[in-house]
């Protein structure tokens, strides 16, 4: 049966025992900016180009031991996510990915901006259709790295980040709070903010909506068939990238701003429990839970 | 995220050194009285300094992100540091990121061209 | 354009092991795995495994588990398929095809089992 | 794995429209979005025609369509043509493998 996830996204009409707009995204392409992946896992097979961009920090600790299974957990799941065959949203899009993160998840400000920059001279150097850009990352507030993401929005490009796992205030983490980026925070199976261990998702007026992003199936890296469940604000962004994707193929002259309010507007309003965000933030947090147009636009989205 | 907000750099640390006038005998000498910021993260674990990202002013090219770059190099050699660029931008933000001694901060905030320096820091997979 | 091109006809003596080869060209190799099925005279075709050219991981169908072994040679685009201990109901026409989805396909390679 | 059930033999007239079923269970065809159909012309390899239930790949004609409701997978061909009589296969996902029916022989009267 249909995961949860994917049918919390998907408009009523569809809800049948399966999820299938079976080519959704197909004239765009997602940029993940990622760990490693595993390209060939069964569930993304063809779907994922691997570019020859790598800019990562060697790992800590002098006894970590490089295990490539899980170098490429978080980007193959994330990769699945967006466009997986079996559980992905966007199962037509195609995807690039580059890696900025290293096999322990982390990354750096300095590698993330030449990564922006490498998909903006491919951008240029040939241009194709609508790109979405997925960050399914977080730092501490950086001007630099807002700064890039600005820029790339300028120039056309869609980017969709996770609004961060600290349980915090999206607003000083980045690229969260590049307003220019489509920041999603993460609620669960019962529309609740997402716990994550002692923290979860990021809240605040930085986050432009919530998705999926608990409990989320996807591709593992353990084996080449193999499927895991996954949390975190990074899941919910790629639901979000999946959807753009999906929008963006149905109708590729959208600006980002029109883009940004279609999201708005068929999102479920006023579902998630406000009680778990702090009191002074409850206002400024945004009650919507990212979902798919509904049967309107039948044959642009499920074509 | 959330388009329409005013930017807050929330705890975001600013730096500023205003800069002085004594400027190395520089040909291409800032415009009097700008100010170049210097930026680091607020989280301190997530620092990594002694990698800093120069950003300089938006219209500038990219021959000249270069000879800001070396001039950055020539100064620091003079001084006794050795420095390393790693990257050149262009494409997007014009600037370069460098690989230096945190002593030499008020002087690549007084290099032309410049409009801050951010010391890099670390990003997490969420 | 994309190719898989595999090596010549076999024949082999009950026993014996064969090792297939299987080269790609034509696509990013690390963007599929390739798969090995075959096909006996007369029958229906016959998923045997599959071996990833990113990481050289396999996945074996149970009923050739342990008889065969998938390798492969990243530096010359070329996957292998050997397969030990042959009977002769091991006569088939062994062929390499693009990924699991299977998409492109090698012209194939007949293995004879004969004594 | 056993094989997924497919008939035998199909035929049909030229400019007629055929239907190929495949029957498997709720762990490969109503499992996954993931069933493909071959056609293989003797002593060939064979050919993909349909992945994915219902995608056609470039090149392919429009005359072939697929679909799945629940377990069975179906690939429809119509205005069948001289040239369309061959061996066709159908395959599935499996949790952790790829199971092939047993081909059907399309004959063109």
């Known amino acids: 049966s249909i995961p949860w996830n994917l049918e919390r996204i998907t408009p009523p009409r569809y809800r049948a025992d399966e999820y299938q707009p079976p080519d959704g995204g197909s004239l765009v392409e997602v940029y993940l900016l990622d760990t490693s992946i595993q390209s060939d896992h069964r569930e993304i097979e063809g779907r994922v180009m691997v570019t020859d961009f790598e800019n990562v920090p060697e790992e800590d600790g002098t006894r970590f031991h490089r295990q490539a299974s899980k170098c490429d957990s978080h980007g193959t799941h994330l990769a699945g996510v967006v466009s997986g065959r079996d559980a992905g949203v966007a199962k037509g899009a195609s995807m690039r990915s580059l890696r900025v993160l290293n096999c322990q998840g982390k990354g750096t400000v300095s590698g993330t901006l030449i990564g922006l920059e490498f998909i903006r001279k491919s951008q240029l150097v040939q241009p194709v259709g609508p790109l979405v850009v997925l960050l399914p990352l977080a730092g501490g507030y950086s001007r630099v790295l807002n700064a890039a993401c600005q820029r790339l929005a300028r120039a056309g490009v869609v980017l969709v980040t996770a609004a961060g796992n600290f349980r915090d205030d999206a607003c000083l983490y980045s690229p969260a709070s590049a307003p220019e980026v489509i920041t999603v925070g993460a609620t669960n199976a019962q529309d609740q903010p997402v716990t994550l261990g002692t923290l979860g998702t990021n809240f605040g007026r930085c986050v432009d909506l919530f998705a999926p992003g608990e409990d989320i199936i996807g591709a593992s890296s353990d084996c080449s068939t193999c499927f895991v469940s996954q949390s975190g604000t990074s899941q919910a962004a790629a639901h979000v990238a999946g959807i753009a994707a999906m929008m963006l193929s149905a109708e590729p002259e959208l600006t980002l701003a029109e883009l940004r309010q279609r999201l708005i507007h068929f999102s479920a309003k006023d579902v998630i429990n406000e009680a778990w965000f702090p009191e002074d933030q409850r206002v400024l947090t945004p009650n919507l839970v990212a979902a798919l147009p509904p049967s309107t636009h039948e044959n642009l989205y499920f074509q | 995220g959330a388009m329409g907000q005013e930017d807050e750099d929330g705890d975001y640390e600013e730096l500023v050194l205003a800069l002085r006038s004594e400027e190395d005998g520089l040909a291409e000498a800032p415009e009097h009285g700008t100010t170049a910021t210097f930026h680091r993260c607020a989280k301190d674990p997530w620092r990594l300094p002694g990698t800093y990202v120069v950003v300089l002013k938006e219209e500038t090219h990219l021959s000249q992100s270069e000879r800001t770059a070396r001039r950055l190099q020539a100064q620091a050699a003079r001084r006794g540091y050795l420095t390393k660029i790693l990257h050149v931008f262009h494409g997007l933000l014009p600037g370069f990121l460098v690989k230096m001694s945190g002593d030499l901060l008020e002087l690549a905030l007084k290099l032309p061209h410049v409009d801050y320096i951010e010391e890099d820091s670390s990003v997490f997979a969420q | 354009q994309i190719q898989l091109v595999q090596s010549g006809a076999e024949v082999k003596k009950p026993g014996a092991s064969v090792k297939v080869s299987c080269k790609a060209s034509?696509?990013?190799?690390?963007?599929?795995?390739i798969s090995w099925v075959r096909q006996a005279p007369g029958q229906g075709l016959e998923w045997m495994g599959w071996?990833?050219?990113?990481?050289?991981?396999?996945n074996y169908a149970q009923k050739v588990q342990g008889s065969v072994t998938m390798t492969t040679d990243t530096s010359t685009s070329t996957v292998y398929m050997e397969l030990r201990s042959l009977r002769s109901d091991d006569t088939a026409v062994y062929y390499c095809?693009?990924?699991?989805?299977?998409?492109?396909w090698g012209q194939g390679t007949t293995v004879t089992v004969s004594s | 794995q056993s094989a997924l059930t497919q008939p035998a033999s199909v035929s049909g007239s030229p400019g007629q429209s055929i239907t190929i079923s495949c029957t498997g269970t709720?762990?490969?065809?109503?499992?996954?979005?993931?069933v493909s159909w071959y056609q293989q012309y003797p002593g060939k390899p064979p050919k993909l025609k349909i992945y994915?239930?219902?995608n056609r790949p470039s090149g392919v004609s429009n005359r072939f369509s697929g679909s799945k409701s629940g377990n069975t997978a179906s690939l429809t061909i119509s205005g069948l043509q001289a040239e369309d009589e061959a061996d066709y296969f159908c395959?599935?996902?499996?949790?952790?493998?790829?199971?092939f029916g047993g081909g059907t022989k399309l004959t063109v009267l």
């Open positions: 994915e239930v219902s």
């Open positions: 395959s599935s996902y499996t949790s952790t493998s790829m199971v």
């Open positions: 095809a693009r990924g699991y989805g299977m998409d492109v």
């Open positions: 071996i990833s050219a990113y990481n050289g991981n396999t």
């Open positions: 709720s762990s490969d065809v109503g499992g996954y979005n993931s």
């Open positions: 034509g696509y990013p190799l690390t963007s599929y795995g």
